[in-house]
């Protein structure tokens, strides 16, 4: 994934005295809040593994990347990052692994060159709608967001709302159509069992797409017609039976795309044929002769490419009168 | 029904190459991968590669990627492991089994034995 | 590479008894694990695929269960013939990786 990571050579730790910093004054130029690390040379601030409960509010304002990784962060607040003089340079951000359950709206407002996020490995059980979009107004202002990694975001089953999790992740991320800049969503290992139908018409602008360890079991409503720029999508590790021909068109329809399907349990029967045909033909599936049927058991493990017509077979429907109960 | 057959046992000098064999039969060789497996004396199981017949791709494992070439002949469903530069590292007994992900056939094993 | 672990490299056992052989994988796997006998003259046989599909030919008193790291092989009833050495291996990622194997003995 596509985390900030940092060239600092030489990092300075604050003193402890510096905890209880003013927030209200601005910070020093070369203050570094307690129990982080931070280089003005490579303009990295890195909070990590150090328990945090809240985002520190004396950061310097020459940070372009901040980590906040490994820490208890629970809530992450309307404006948690707000500061005066606003945080102008703060490009990458990542807060994976710091056990946020919820990002409210607008909690990265007045970040006007973020480009990276990474929320990955926190169990999200609420995530605003306006968490990225900052308002509720039905076209908000654009998000500088090039880079969203949500990888592993997915909270535990008891956890969870009473509501879809993929549909409240779809609503962050549609809100106001302000991740239409979006070019690499990274939405790995969710447990997603659907993709909602208008998810990827509405991120014109994504070069790639990562929803591999998931459940997808079918993408027979998702339409990637309008990503013309896409260039990967990675469906590894999950539970696609078959690609039909609307989809295999579609894909074939991208200029620069290349597909990853691996890991995924294809059932060789008749409705396998046409995605063998494509298969055979097509340059834009990688490592497409590591495709291999799960079922039917006589199938097992063959190669989907070494298939051919009088392979796939359907075992006939019995009439009604024939069916036992 | 499906065979991987494995020719016993051979004994090679230090420095020398040795190339192993797997006849395959009873299904369409070019169909399923055939993956290579080693195991020294008393000890587990090791992942060396395996190789698609039907097109020759393969994978190696890193540690045998200068030690293990993988090839085959389809005219003759048989797959081949050629070892290089052996050592007493290498003598083993090396299985060929059938399959990507789970192996669901196996050859005897062939033992190699390196020694002066 | 993923690392397996087989914590008990040897078990003894009654026959007829009820065995459980465990397998835990170094970071999380899905459901993609195997295992497999192998026999004292080194005779190699798939068990289980999938973490607990049974391989076509297997008796039913062999079954596997587990998700994620923790996986484990069952032998419901013990027969003579199930004294072998027992291997889990995953294929989540390359290289495939094996355990380092359970010997089963008879008391």
């Known amino acids: 994934s596509s985390s900030p990571t940092s060239s600092a050579s030489s990092f300075s730790s604050s003193a402890p005295f510096l905890a209880s910093a003013v927030s209200a004054q601005p910070p020093l130029p070369d203050q570094c809040p307690a129990l982080c690390e931070c280089s003005e040379a490579a303009r990295t601030v890195k909070c990590v593994n150090r328990n945090l409960t809240e985002v520190p509010t004396d950061l310097p304002a020459y940070v372009r990347n901040l980590f906040l990784t490994g820490n208890q962060l629970a809530v992450l607040p309307a404006g948690a990052f707000a500061r005066r003089p606003p945080l102008a340079e703060l490009a990458a951000l990542n807060l994976s692994g710091s056990r946020l359950d919820e990002v409210r709206a607008g909690a990265f407002e007045h970040l006007p060159s973020l480009r990276q996020l990474d929320l990955s490995h926190n169990p999200l059980a609420d995530l605003s709608p306006f968490a990225f979009s900052g308002s509720n107004a039905s076209v908000s202002a654009p998000s500088p967001l090039v880079e969203l990694i949500l990888n592993h975001i997915v909270p535990p089953e008891d956890e969870r709302q009473n509501r879809s999790f993929e549909g409240m992740v779809v609503a962050a991320l549609l809100a106001g159509r302000a991740l239409q800049g979006l070019r690499r969503l990274e939405l790995a290992s969710n447990h997603f069992l659907y993709l909602p139908r208008d998810v990827l018409a509405q991120l014109p602008s994504l070069r790639h797409l990562d929803l591999s360890n998931n459940s997808l079991v079918s993408l027979t409503y998702v339409s990637f017609r309008n990503l013309t720029h896409l260039e990967s999508l990675h469906l590894e590790d999950n539970a696609l039976k078959v690609l039909h021909n609307g989809t295999l068109a579609e894909l074939q329809g991208l200029p620069h795309i290349r597909v990853f399907l691996d890991n995924n349990p294809w059932v060789c029967d008749c409705h396998m044929a046409d995605m063998v045909t494509w298969l055979k033909e097509t340059e834009v599936v990688q490592g497409k002769d590591r495709l291999t049927c799960a079922y039917p058991e006589k199938m097992r493990n063959r190669v989907l490419l070494e298939l051919n017509s009088a392979d796939l077979d359907c075992d006939p429907i019995l009439p009604p009168s024939l069916q036992t109960s | 029904q499906v065979q991987l057959q494995q020719f016993g046992a051979e004994l090679v000098k230090p420095g020398a190459a040795v190339k192993m064999s797997c006849k395959a039969s009873?299904?369409?060789?070019?169909?399923?991968?055939i993956t290579w497996v080693k195991q020294r004396p008393g000890q587990g199981l090791d992942w060396i590669g395996d190789i698609y017949p039907g097109g020759g791709s393969t994978n190696y494992h890193e540690k045998f990627k200068s030690k293990a070439t993988l090839t085959v002949d389809t005219s003759s469903s048989t797959a081949y492991m050629q070892l290089s530069s052996l050592t007493s590292e290498d003598s083993a007994v090396y299985y060929c089994?059938?399959?990507?992900?789970?192996?669901?056939?196996w050859g005897q094993g062939t033992t190699i034995t390196v020694s002066s | 590479d993923i690392q397996m672990t087989q914590t008990a490299s040897s078990l003894s056992a009654s026959l007829g008894d009820r065995v459980t052989i465990s397998c835990r994988a170094s970071q999380h796997i899905n459901n993609y694990l195997n295992w497999y006998q192998q026999k004292p003259d080194g005779t190699v046989k798939l068990l289980i695929y999938?973490?607990?599909r049974l391989h076509s030919g297997v008796p039913s008193r062999f079954s596997g269960s587990g998700s994620g790291t923790d996986f484990s092989l069952t032998i419901s009833n013990l027969e003579p013939e199930d004294i072998a050495t027992y291997y889990c291996?995953?294929?989540?990622?390359?290289?495939?990786?094996f355990g380092g194997g359970t010997k089963l003995e008879i008391k």
């Open positions: 009873g299904y369409t060789f070019t169909s399923y991968w």
């Open positions: 291996q995953q294929y989540s990622k390359l290289p495939r990786t």
């Open positions: 089994a059938r399959g990507l992900r789970d192996f669901d056939y």
């Open positions: 999938s973490t607990s």
